[in-house]
Interface confidence: medium
């Protein structure tokens, strides 16, 4: 708490300006009116206050708005936002995308802080869903934002918002997240033609089921190895050698370099060696000729 002391004669602030930058902590507390500060918050950003001084200014706003700041103040917080705690932010009701953008700009270039995460959470919950404009904004500032959401949270993303997603936004997503996003992407891009569709859907294919991969193999898509390596193992295993060859096109040669890594390794173990040999890549580890393959999982399902 800052001690209450009388403002020295002639030091009362009539406006928020740079004459305040060398005020001592107690002088700021005594000489700056909180209501004045609230109406001139936009000026704070042009004045190089020290961290200690920012703490005093925050304290004044906290006293003025104990239930949480109004959006008119929040929008102009600028770098004072960096002084807010998640607890402070939970008191806010942020509804304007402009306010969100203004505060994200302050944190630009830094990792997503707990403050920013709380702000985004409050904003998205207030809107009810992650609409396209919000998602556009969030992924512009934090490319990994989508992948920081739980599958449950991702379920609130409308398919129309998927158009805002760039490949790099999905770099850190795990299979569970892609399982949720893929059907949305499939729906979003369903009216596109073959090659355009593949370009858009490619980043989401880590959530694709076997039947969709089979369908893609009939469309001459020439999937690259990096995309293939991110596919769900359980979706790749049922694919035949011919289907994988069609799916990868000229990239099929890359299988050799990946034969010890999933999902290629597990897929090889499921193929007949004869079939693998037709690729001419020297892939080893398939089922020897003359062996009978029993699909026990199918047998269990039937019984």
């Amino acid at each position: 708490e800052v001690e209450k002391t009388a403002c020295p004669s002639g030091k009362k602030a009539r406006e928020i300006d740079e004459s305040l930058i060398f005020y001592k902590k107690w002088e700021l507390e005594a000489c700056v009116d909180a209501a004045l500060l609230a109406t001139q918050m936009d000026r704070v950003n042009a004045i190089p206050f020290t961290y200690e001084q920012l703490d005093v200014l925050k304290h004044k706003l906290d006293e003025l708005y104990p239930q949480g700041y109004p959006e008119s103040v929040i929008q102009h917080l600028g770098y004072l936002f960096l002084k807010m705690s998640p607890e402070d932010i939970r008191k806010w009701n942020v509804t304007s995308l402009e306010t969100l953008k203004a505060l994200l700009e302050v944190n630009k270039g830094h990792e997503m802080s707990p403050q920013v995460a709380t702000l985004i959470d409050r904003f998205v919950k207030g809107r009810g869903q992650l609409d396209k404009d919000t998602l556009d904004t969030l992924t512009a500032f934090y490319p990994g934002y989508l992948c920081s959401l739980s599958p449950e949270e991702l379920s609130s993303v409308p398919p129309s918002s998927i158009w805002a997603v760039r490949p790099q936004d999905l770099d850190t997503c795990d299979p569970r997240q892609l399982d949720v996003l893929y059907p949305k992407a499939r729906l979003a891009f369903q009216n596109m033609n073959g090659s355009e569709y593949f370009v858009k859907i490619q980043s989401f294919l880590g959530g694709a089921p076997t039947e969709d991969l089979k369908a893609l193999s009939q469309q001459n898509v020439s999937m690259d190895l990096a995309t293939f390596m991110k596919l769900r193992t359980d979706a790749v295993l049922p694919l035949t050698v011919a289907e994988v060859q069609k799916l990868l096109g000229p990239h099929v040669e890359g299988l050799k370099a990946e034969e010890r890594h999933r999902p290629v390794r597990d897929w090889i173990l499921r193929q007949r060696q004869d079939d693998l040999d037709t690729l001419g890549l020297g892939l080893q580890g398939g089922i020897p000729n003359g062996y009978l393959v029993l699909d026990l999982s199918m047998q269990e399902a039937l019984s």
């Epitope: 300006d17 190089p48 020290t50 961290y51 200690e52 001084q53 770098y79």
Partner: antibody
């Protein structure tokens, strides 16, 4: 090129005066608060004085208060330090330094090469 | 606010991990910067806000800490890293620097 170039250093007798200048280029000078930092021979760094972007606010370390005056001419992109009543302990390399823009960024991302002030009889 | 750096000097070899500490006489939040200075040269900003790496500074430099205790770490010392390192607080006026830590070749 973004740079700061100090001048005006030299040998002066105790009680004498000296005016240091710092010419800035490559950035919007008036947008930044500026400081003088000094370093006595073989010693550490000491912050001496600072001035706001417009020149309307100034601050001094206790060791130089009342003797040194910081000022700036934004039309000439130049920072000054007027040093009066100089003492032997003011002997140092004087650096002019640009501080980061807000928030509270009173640290220095650009320094001049420094100018040596020697106070000796 | 007084800043106390330790050690005042240290000898290390290329490839070593080097740690320098800076202790503030009172809490300064994360308002701490680290500089590198080579003989006859001006200081160069390495770290600000206790842990943010200045643009163009190699990633082998890192900073940590908050409140009163701070650390500068060089993960793998390179020949060009032999210099004197200073911490500086910018929480309040007057701005103050630590006494410096000289990193020498063993």
């Amino acid at each position: 090129e973004v740079q700061l170039l100090e001048s005006g250093g030299g040998l002066v007798q105790p009680g004498g005066s000296l005016r240091l200048s710092c010419a800035a280029s490559g950035f919007t000078f008036s947008s930044y608060a500026m400081s003088w930092v000094r370093q006595a021979p073989g010693k550490g760094l000491e912050w001496v004085s600072a001035i706001s972007g417009s020149g309307g606010s100034t601050y001094y370390a206790d060791s130089v208060k009342g003797r040194f005056t910081i000022s700036r001419d934004n039309s000439k992109n130049t920072l000054y330090l007027q040093m009066n009543s100089l003492r032997a302990e003011d002997t140092a390399v004087y650096y002019c330094a640009k501080n980061r823009p807000p928030p509270g960024y009173w640290y220095f991302d650009l320094w001049g090469r420094g100018t040596l002030v020697t106070v000796s009889s | 606010i007084q800043l106390t750096q330790s050690p005042s000097s240290l000898s290390a070899s290329v490839g070593d991990r080097v740690t320098i500490t800076c202790r503030a006489s009172q809490g300064i939040s994360s308002a701490l910067a680290w500089y590198q200075q080579k003989p006859g040269k001006a200081p160069k900003l390495l770290i600000y806000d206790a842990s943010s790496l200045e643009s163009g500074v190699p990633s082998r430099f890192s900073g940590s800490g908050s409140g009163t205790d701070f650390t500068l770490t060089i993960s793998s010392l390179q020949p060009e890293d032999f210099a004197t390192y200073y911490c500086q607080q910018f929480n309040n006026y007057p701005l103050t620097f630590g006494g410096g830590t000289k990193v020498e070749i063993k």
